[in-house]
């Protein structure tokens, strides 16, 4: 058993039919010693008597808010929550396993530029009874300083037959050097309590391999004088970092007819124009990514032909 | 500790084309060594990320763009000091600072050539003979180093005379890949900023 | 005292469906989640199926997959296992069982497909 | 499709140790806990060993398990004639999970 944050306990359990469950001593935070009973959650059963109370917790029906009272008095309060271990591996029953870029991927970060700043997202099913807490830190053994707002709901979309809500933070590193190589990666913790069960999840990577730019802006067309070829022209994302000589970006540029089975043609370039071939009905779109090192394209940008 | 923005001749930079060589061939080395590799830990979420030229060099404070002299976390330098004098450098006007910038690359780049060729020799006595490093990214690393032309020491080939742990060199392989690659990538920045410049 | 007894094995013609039961008792069914595992006949154990605790979550191994189908009813406290489209391959004991550390099985069901 | 890998047959006299090997890879044994399972002929599987090492109770001390990087062992110290059975060892993938992933399995012989 571990304290969560004041008067929240987390009990860890070994998951399985008929398991003997954990002995828990809970202790009234009081100087009486005497006349006092124990009541969990709203029923006015007594549990027991005395300044301490031993409960053996087995199940969800053991968990919950357990309440130390003397005449009619609330003393104190002492809630219990459940940590599932199922054959050796915690349980993962809140969030969904959203299998991009691998399986059992339950949060997913990204960053619009090498500032240090990044936003986590999760999904879940679960509409209520829910609270997310978020901690993180550059490493691990000597952890560095980032800071994190509050999750919010950010998202919410019918699947099937379920609804499934999207929460996302935004954390930021306190002392971060967009030019700086990074060798202690980023590590992201969750803690999740649906009713009286706790899980928490982490994810831990390098800031340069969850960039992702926003598209390129201002995407303009100008045809060229006698000849169905268009300049395309666009210019890099605001919210890439400075300078754009040292953090520089590629370009892919792609023709769409309004059919998505026409053959799509692509070019790239480290350059902000191309010059490409406009089709009637076609559209051009553009996205970008660091010109060094590999991590996820941006949207695309696009603008019609016509 | 920070570039200028200074304003070279024209087609001043021929390593801006080596430098592109350099990221090219490391990365696909390093792709080499996981895909070979697969059942030794070699992924960038399994390795220690080590960095061989930790308080040797200072390539990344030194070769800071102007712009981000201001932001403070870029600031937290050691003192290095360089040789300088570099035929990359095509241009008087080009400062101080500039070169102990390029002279930091060129002892980054002699330090992990010391190394892989270190490695390939313990690899070239495995007899799994299961992997060796590319003798194209080693060409391209010493292409680099004459491109920027400094005066240095030569670091003697290290050698050992104890029996190769092979499962370990392997491992060294990927964990300087993965270092080198981060190097490299820092590199090109570099010389597309001065290129610009 | 856990206890997990199978129904609903026999003999089946390739291509025609079956279902399989497992009746649970002794233990809160609805807070763990339950596999389907099979041995083919002189062969090893292989894993079939698993289903959560709350039947939300499903997860197949990729010989039976688009062909079985794991549900439970947690008010009768029974796990199913409807096979369809069977194959001579799926020829073996079916046992059911919890998921944990410590795991309780089924007595097995024999499923023979033959024509 | 079997990725634990497992001698197909062991043997020993009584009063011998007996040991059955159970190898595997990174993401699998390397990550995750392993068990052991006893069957005997036209029964279920018996738990022997769960969390690499641990004995489930009424399980006799003579059986013990062991896990070193992405391998397993089972060790039978005094095998009796009663242990002569099928064994198999049990993991989880990192990128499967729940599925089972079971050994190959390892005839034990009590000459």
């Known amino acids: 058993i571990w304290e969560l944050k004041k008067d929240v306990y987390v009990v860890e359990l070994d998951w399985y039919p008929d398991a003997p469950g954990e002995m828990v001593v809970l202790t009234c935070d009081t100087p009486e010693e005497d006349g006092i009973t124990w009541t969990l959650d709203q029923s006015s059963e007594v549990l027991g008597s005395g300044k301490t109370l031993t409960i053996q917790v087995k199940e969800f029906g053991d968990a919950g808010q357990y309440t130390c009272h003397k005449g009619g008095e609330v003393l104190s309060h002492s809630l219990l929550l459940l940590h599932k271990k199922e054959d050796g591996i915690w349980s993962t029953d809140i969030l969904k396993d959203q299998k991009e870029p691998k399986n059992k991927t339950f949060l997913r970060c990204e960053a619009k530029n090498y500032s240090g700043r990044f936003t986590c997202w999760w999904l879940t099913t679960i509409s209520t009874d829910l609270t997310f807490s978020v901690k993180s830190s550059r490493g691990s053994s000597d952890p560095q300083g980032v800071t994190c707002g509050a999750a919010t709901l950010s998202a919410e979309r019918v699947r099937g037959d379920n609804k499934e809500y999207e929460y996302s933070v935004e954390c930021q590193e306190d002392s971060a050097c967009p030019a700086a190589e990074e060798s202690l990666p980023i590590e992201v913790m969750v803690d999740a309590v649906h009713k009286l069960k706790y899980e928490n999840y982490t994810s831990s990577f390098f800031i340069r391999d969850i960039i992702k730019p926003d598209p390129p802006k201002n995407l303009q067309l100008k045809p060229l004088k006698n000849s169905r070829q268009v300049e395309v022209s666009w210019e890099y994302p605001d919210t890439w970092s400075t300078p754009h000589s040292y953090f520089s970006l590629t370009f892919c540029v792609q023709v769409q007819g309004k059919s998505k089975r026409e053959k799509k043609d692509r070019v790239f370039t480290d350059k902000t124009s191309a010059t490409v071939i406009c089709r009637k009905n076609a559209s051009i779109s553009v996205r970008a990514q660091d010109r060094y090192y590999s991590s996820s394209w941006s949207e695309w940008a696009s603008v019609p032909c016509s | 500790r920070n570039l200028p923005v200074a304003t070279p001749d024209p087609g001043m930079f021929p390593c801006l084309h080596h430098s592109q060589n350099l990221l090219r061939a490391v990365s696909n080395m390093l792709q080499k060594a996981r895909q070979t590799l697969e059942f030794y830990p070699c992924t960038s979420e399994e390795i220690d990320h080590e960095d061989i030229t930790k308080d040797k060099t200072s390539t990344v404070e030194a070769c800071l763009p102007l712009e981000l002299t201001k932001n403070e976390s870029c600031l937290n330098s050691r003192e290095t000091s360089f040789i300088t004098n570099g035929s990359c450098l095509a241009s008087r006007k080009t400062s101080f600072m500039m070169a102990l910038c390029l002279s930091s690359i060129y002892e980054d780049l002699k330090m992990y050539q010391v190394e892989f060729k270190t490695m390939n020799a313990k690899l070239l006595m495995d007899p799994k003979r299961q992997i060796f490093l590319d003798q194209n990214m080693l060409a391209v690393i010493d292409e680099l180093m004459q491109a920027l032309n400094f005066n240095s020491e030569t670091v003697p080939q290290k050698s050992s005379l104890e029996e190769p742990d092979f499962y370990k060199t392997k491992i060294k392989l990927c964990i300087l890949l993965h270092a080198f690659r981060i190097r490299a990538v820092t590199i090109d920045r570099v010389m597309s900023y001065l290129n610009a410049s | 005292q856990v206890q997990l007894v199978q129904s609903g094995g026999g003999v089946v013609q390739p291509g025609r469906s079956l279902r399989l039961s497992c009746a649970a008792s002794?233990?809160?069914?609805?807070?763990?989640?339950m596999h389907w595992v099979r041995q083919a006949p002189g062969k090893g154990l292989e894993w079939v199926a698993f289903?959560?605790?709350?039947?939300?979550?499903?997860y197949y191994a990729d010989s039976v997959k688009g062909r079985f189908t794991i549900s439970r009813d947690n008010s009768k406290n029974t796990l199913y296992l409807q096979m369809k489209s069977l194959r001579a391959e799926d020829t073996a004991v079916y046992y059911c069982k919890t998921h944990g550390s410590h795991d309780n099985w089924g007595q097995g069901t024999m499923v023979t497909v033959s024509s | 499709s079997y990725v634990l890998t497992q001698p197909p047959s062991v043997s020993g006299t009584p009063g011998q140790r007996v040991t059955i090997s159970c190898s595997g890879g990174r993401s699998n044994i390397g990550k995750n806990t392993v068990k052991w399972y006893q069957q005997l002929p036209g029964t279920a599987p018996k738990l022997l060993i769960y969390?690499?090492?641990q004995r489930p109770s009424g399980v006799p001390d003579r059986f013990s398990g062991s896990k070193s990087g992405t391998s397993a062992s089972l060790a039978i110290t005094g095998v009796q004639a009663e242990d002569e059975a099928d064994y198999y060892c049990q993991s989880y993938d990192r990128g499967t999970h729940p599925a089972l992933l079971f050994g190959t399995g390892t005839k034990v012989t009590v000459l």
């Open positions: 289903i959560r605790y709350d039947g939300s979550n499903k």
């Open positions: 002794g233990f809160t069914f609805s807070s763990y989640g």
């Open positions: 969390g690499n090492d």
